[in-house]
Interface confidence: low
């Protein structure tokens, strides 16, 4: 016996969040893994008085304590609809079915005399049917439904007389069913029987407050189990050759402070006081855990030496239950001020360390949904995915000997103190219906797929490719708004006087009269922050730099009456100094953010983008920028993410759609102006960049979710892309969806009607497609009332906790970008596409492994789109150059300009132009390739201020 469970909280220093196998493992379970599903008799059988069944303590408890529940009589009626249960089992394709025998259905008053014939026949028929189907039965003798007569006559499990009576009942079951049953469970989760039956009073028999009774009950349950195990071991195992255990349930807990010894001690105590209470005598040294003996000496019964010897080793495997009943409620004592956690993998590791690596059957696992959820139990899929992933990791990475898994539960039914307010079935049952049809939920389809594949196959992404991007590919980095320096920060050479220092010993400068020196004109490098920008860009080794101008700084009045020439000079310097390093600029004219609209003050006060005249003001501003910078800038973005301004103009859907309309017009006016006036001489290209996350159905088994995913793309991307790239009008699907909600009185929103002139103005006003892509969203359909953009879409988002995610919960889903690029090409034709921002936030200030992982994986998918799908991808701009103070850490540089290690990673990808074959010699000609100019770099770094 090892007892080293507490070591589990000393975290592995090698844990890396970007080794995805530590979050989710695409792998299969061992070859003969035992897949099953379970039910409890009281929960699903119904017929509590039918055919001679006696009442149980729960039948009584329901009538006395759960007044809003008539009885378990409705439930799923498994006693009547046995065939329907068997069909459900067939559907899923399980290897075993774990069910419990109702003690009072066999022996109405609990005492083993002549069994109730109808009850005996029911279980016999069930077992025969399972054997016929090649489904192994795992039979639980006691799942909480003690015959009421034994409670009333003896006081139930408080009285050790029950031990022998239980053994008689077990003997009968072994005799009658043992030829067909190879796996037996004596008692299901004795902790809950004792703690909630006699401590909190939440479970039958509903006694509470007497701690001595709680531990007496626990004591008798352990002795009852042990007696039955010895009985089976001696009299039945030799010829029946089965295995027997007891299902022990537990929560899991994490310390508040992972390095604090006291917190770790409390976590160990927490586990020991719940799981150890029963596991230590049975799987450990035969006695209660030392901590419990010390703490509860006044109420905890004592095992004699002989009893310890008798208890020890009385289980042929470790049957473990991990589900909501052990979490909610978790009594205060068990929580011990630490943090409850659903980390099944760690719980299994604790069992491995504490009980010397036993063979483990997960005898109950799953979560619950609200009773209103019918067959679309999306969150249940993700809970199951998470739990199963943790089990697989435990097997494959931690070498834990889990040999089987019981999904809980086959059917919706009576959920103890929660009665019918929650559902735990993989099959939906309408309790008010006569026929109690078993309808497979999404989770049933999901579990069926898991069983069929014996785990998780990697279907989402294809293997990495080797190859390179074209020689003219833009390798970029994006920055948000650059605030211009109003005055050059470096005034040297502008003062013509000569000074002598410390001439009189007073440590001051003294002007030398009569001497005048030559000054020099202002230079770009007088701007300190340009110097910083250039140093960072040079280290990035990019070919392109995307940054945004500050409209409010360039035109403080919002019109051309007051042009800030110094700001324009500053921006011209950024571009021209970049060009000296071989870095071209992609300039964004307008970059609003959630916190700051970035409009000139007068425009902001005149209703901003709700006012159509803002579009004309934007055209004038764009014209000024084209005129002043266009000789140097060949790639322009008019507006960054206009489709995200809905976050700001969100008072109503009509505000959102009105603002969007004016943004589209503003862009089109600017594009038309460039096309007419500047393109002939400047030969640049103009577009606008759209926020373009991909969307996947949260629940792939629900048609409504597939429709929601497409609807998300329509409302998010097509909303702007359709009018500009294609038709000059809003997407028909989006218009119709909003109109349909309007007709049904669910929304008063309406998309603006476009005139023929407006359609002509908008259509075709892009020279390339610019997409900002960060992540993939998992979407589900949910009908939402209200007249705002967010509710018009009828979409909710789901966070998949098994996915690698950033601190701001951006999921790393590389294959989403490839799907997006294909969708854009399919919908809008074969055009040049730039990914104008793509990146992830990463907490690390130096070794930003998450960002490196993200860049590598996402660029792989972009390369697949280029090489395999033949998408005309022209550039990738990583987001972003430097992080801002107190904002999520998206930067390659910290806010105080310290470089992170992802820069070298990106450098390597850029210099390789992707992911070339080993020894690939496909180099670009000198003119095309951006060779690093060592002298330039030296000058940038050393140029005096």
């Amino acid at each position: 016996f090892s007892g080293d469970g507490r070591a589990i909280w000393s975290k592995n220093p090698n844990f890396t969040p970007v080794n995805e196998s530590q979050l989710f493992l695409y792998d299969t379970f061992p070859k003969n893994f035992f897949w099953g599903i379970g039910t409890g008799a009281l929960q699903v059988e119904g017929s509590w008085k039918k055919d001679g069944k006696g009442p149980s303590i729960w039948d009584h408890f329901i009538h006395t304590h759960l007044k809003n529940v008539s009885s378990t009589n409705g439930s799923s009626d498994s006693y009547i609809f046995l065939e329907k249960d068997l069909s459900a089992l067939d559907f899923i394709g399980v290897s075993f079915y774990q069910f419990s025998i109702s003690w009072p259905r066999l022996f109405p008053d609990g005492i083993v005399t002549v069994a109730n014939a109808k009850g005996l026949q029911y279980y016999s028929t069930l077992l025969d049917a399972l054997v016929l189907r090649n489904i192994e039965p795992i039979v639980t003798l006691y799942h909480w439904d003690l015959p009421l007569a034994l409670q009333e006559k003896y006081g139930g499990w408080k009285n050790d007389t029950i031990i022998d009576i239980f053994n008689d009942y077990a003997t009968y079951c072994f005799q009658m069913f043992g030829d067909r049953v190879k796996y037996w469970i004596t008692i299901h989760n004795p902790y809950l029987v004792a703690w909630h039956g006699y401590g909190t009073g939440m479970h039958a028999p509903g006694e509470k407050g007497n701690l001595a009774a709680v531990y007496t009950v626990g004591h008798n349950l352990i002795k009852a189990h042990s007696k039955v195990w010895h009985n089976y071991n001696t009299h039945f195992r030799p010829h029946q050759k089965g295995w027997l255990s007891i299902t022990l349930g537990s929560h899991w807990i994490e310390p508040n402070r992972s390095e604090n010894t006291m917190d770790i001690f409390k976590c160990q105590q927490s586990m020991v006081s719940v799981l150890g209470w029963f596991a230590n005598p049975i799987h450990g040294d035969g006695d209660y855990p030392e901590g419990m003996r010390k703490k509860l000496f006044s109420v905890l019964p004592i095992f004699s030496e002989a009893e310890k010897h008798e208890m020890r080793g009385t289980a042929d495997f470790f049957a473990f239950s991990f589900g909501p009943n052990n979490f909610k409620p978790l009594n205060t004592m068990a929580k011990m001020g630490q943090n409850v956690s659903l980390n099944l993998r760690e719980a299994l590791n604790w069992i491995k360390l504490e009980y010397n690596n036993p063979r483990i059957l997960i005898a109950e696992n799953g979560w619950f949904t609200d009773s209103r959820v019918k067959t679309e139990d999306t969150t249940a899929i993700y809970m199951m995915k998470n739990f199963l992933s943790q089990v697989l990791q435990a097997i494959r990475l931690d070498e834990i000997r889990v040999f089987g898994y019981t999904a809980w539960s086959l059917l919706d039914g009576f959920e103890w103190q929660d009665a019918y307010t929650i559902r735990r079935g993989l099959f939906y049952v309408d309790f008010n219906s006569k026929q109690k049809e078993r309808k497979p939920k999404s989770s049933a389809h999901y579990y069926k797929q898991i069983i069929r594949e014996n785990g998780f196959s990697l279907k989402e992404s294809t293997p990495d490719v080797q190859g390179q991007f074209p020689c003219d590919f833009s390798w970029g980095v994006t920055e948000s708004v650059l605030k211009p320096e109003s005055v050059a920060s470096s005034p040297q050479f502008s003062d013509p006087h000569l000074y002598v220092w410390n001439a009189t010993g007073n440590r001051l400068l003294h002007r030398v009269e009569g001497v005048r020196l030559k000054t020099r004109p202002a230079q770009c490098t007088d701007f300190v922050n340009i110097k910083k920008q250039l140093e960072m860009l040079a280290r990035m080794k990019v070919t392109h730099y995307r940054f945004a101008l500050d409209w409010a700084s360039v035109l403080p009045t919002g019109n051309l009456s007051a042009v800030n020439r110094q700001a324009l000079r500053y921006y011209r310097c950024v571009v021209s100094e970049g060009l000296k390093l071989g870095i071209s600029a992609m300039v964004t004219l307008y970059y609003p953010t959630h916190a700051h609209l970035g409009l000139p003050e007068p425009l902001l006060h005149a209703d901003g983008w709700l006012n159509p005249s803002t579009a004309e003001a934007f055209q004038a501003y764009a014209g000024l920028c084209f005129q002043e910078l266009g000789d140097l800038v060949k790639l322009w973005i008019t507006i960054n993410e206009p489709n995200r301004l809905s976050d700001i103009y969100n008072r109503s859907g009509n505000d959102t759609y009105g603002a969007a309309h004016n943004l589209l017009v503003a862009h089109a006016l600017a594009w038309r102006l460039y096309d007419r006036q500047f393109r002939p001489s400047q030969r640049g290209a103009v577009s606008l960049s759209l926020h373009a996350d991909w969307a996947e159905p949260a629940n792939p088994y629900a048609d409504s979710h597939w429709r929601a995913a497409e609807r998300f793309l329509q409302f998010e991307i097509a909303w702007f892309a359709e009018p500009l790239f294609k038709t000059g009008d809003y997407p028909a699907a989006m218009r119709e969806y909003i109109a349909s909600k309007h007709r049904r009185g669910l929304s008063s929103s309406a998309l603006p009607r476009l005139t023929e002139a407006e359609r002509r103005l908008l259509k075709g006003t892009v020279d390339f497609c610019a997409l900002n892509h960060f992540t993939t969203r998992f979407v589900m359909h949910e009908q939402l009332a209200g007249s705002r953009y967010d509710s018009d879409r009828d979409i909710q988002f789901l966070q998949d906790i098994t996915r690698l995610s950033s601190p701001t919960r951006l999921a790393v889903i590389p294959w989403g970008v490839r799907k997006l690029l294909r969708w854009v090409r399919r919908n809008y034709g074969d055009m040049d596409i730039y990914i104008t921002a793509s990146g992830i936030d990463d907490q690390a200030l130096e070794d930003d492994r998450l960002r490196k992982y993200y860049l590598g994986k996402y660029l792989q998918e972009v390369l697949k789109a280029y090489l395999i799908d033949k998408v005309r991808i022209k550039g990738y701009y990583a987001f972003k150059l430097a992080e801002e103070k107190s904002k999520p850490r998206f930067g390659f540089f910290t806010s105080d300009f310290k470089a992170k290690s992802s820069i070298q990673f990106y450098n390597k990808v850029i210099s390789s132009r992707g992911f070339p074959f080993e020894n690939s010699s496909s180099r670009c000609s000198q003119t095309q390739e951006n060779t690093e100019c060592t002298v330039c770099l030296f000058l940038v770094q050393k140029k005096p201020l």
Partner: antibody, heavy 124, light 109 residues
């Protein structure tokens, strides 16, 4: 739709007994998972819990006011009644009733629905 | 009896994050609930069971609880969040409800 509505006198004289009624709709008072509390708030001051009645009719009272309070319920009328004896001007406050639900546990998961409150002034 | 201590006031600029604390002896082992109360209105439950949000409460409201302090965090604070906030626990030993003294959240500007 779950609602609670408090009713009772607006003005009470010192030494008199205050009787407040909370009428509930949208749920049943004999639901095993529901309890009702009374809370008060003197003008400009914090919330102060007074009493609670559990689904099984068990009652719990604020220690400092226990001797003056009685809480009861009439399930058939969907009403919870609070009486407070020997009223004093310092008892001037807005009195709220609120529902608590156990969603899956031993403890209540907070007071999820409150009445709009009834203001009681104690003055001679 | 169990005592919950809250700071009388917290001020924060719009768009920033507000953190309101609730101190109590080993409060981490209790379930903490948080209420928002605007002038002239009844309290509204914004977080229950330490960190769960009732439906209709924005994701900006979150809670945590460990050791001797529970915290209500309101990210991206809006002017409409200006209100009094109360923490509450059930004292399991006495079956009493305990409220904190309340914190007035002021949104600057």
């Amino acid at each position: 739709q779950v609602t609670l509505k408090e009713s009772g006198p607006v003005l009470v004289k010192p030494t008199e007994t205050l009787t407040l009624t909370c009428t509930v709709s949208g749920f049943s008072l004999n639901n095993a998972r529901v309890g009702v509390s009374w809370i008060r708030q003197p003008p400009g001051k914090a919330l102060e819990w007074l009493a609670h009645i559990f689904s099984n009719d068990e009652k719990s009272y604020s220690t400092s006011l226990k001797s003056r309070l009685t809480i009861s319920k009439d399930t058939s009328k969907s009403q919870v009644v609070l009486t407070m004896t020997n009223m004093d001007p310092v008892d001037t406050a807005t009195y709220y009733c609120a529902r608590s639900v156990v969603t899956g546990g031993y403890y209540y998961d907070g007071m999820d629905v409150w009445g709009q409150g009834t203001t009681v002034t104690v003055s001679s | 009896s169990y005592v919950l201590t809250q700071p009388p006031s917290v001020s924060v600029a719009p768009g920033q994050t507000a953190r309101i604390t609730c101190g109590g002896n080993n409060i981490g082992s209790e379930s903490v609930h948080w209420y928002q109360q605007k002038p002239g209105q009844a309290p509204v439950l914004v977080v229950y069971d330490d960190s769960d949000r009732p439906s209709g409460i924005p994701e900006r409201f979150s809670g945590s609880n460990s050791g001797n302090t529970a915290t209500l965090t309101i990210s991206r604070v809006e002017a409409g969040d200006e209100a009094d906030y109360y923490c509450q626990v059930w004292d399991g030993n006495s079956d009493h409800v305990v409220f904190g003294g309340g914190t007035k959240l002021t949104v600057l500007g």
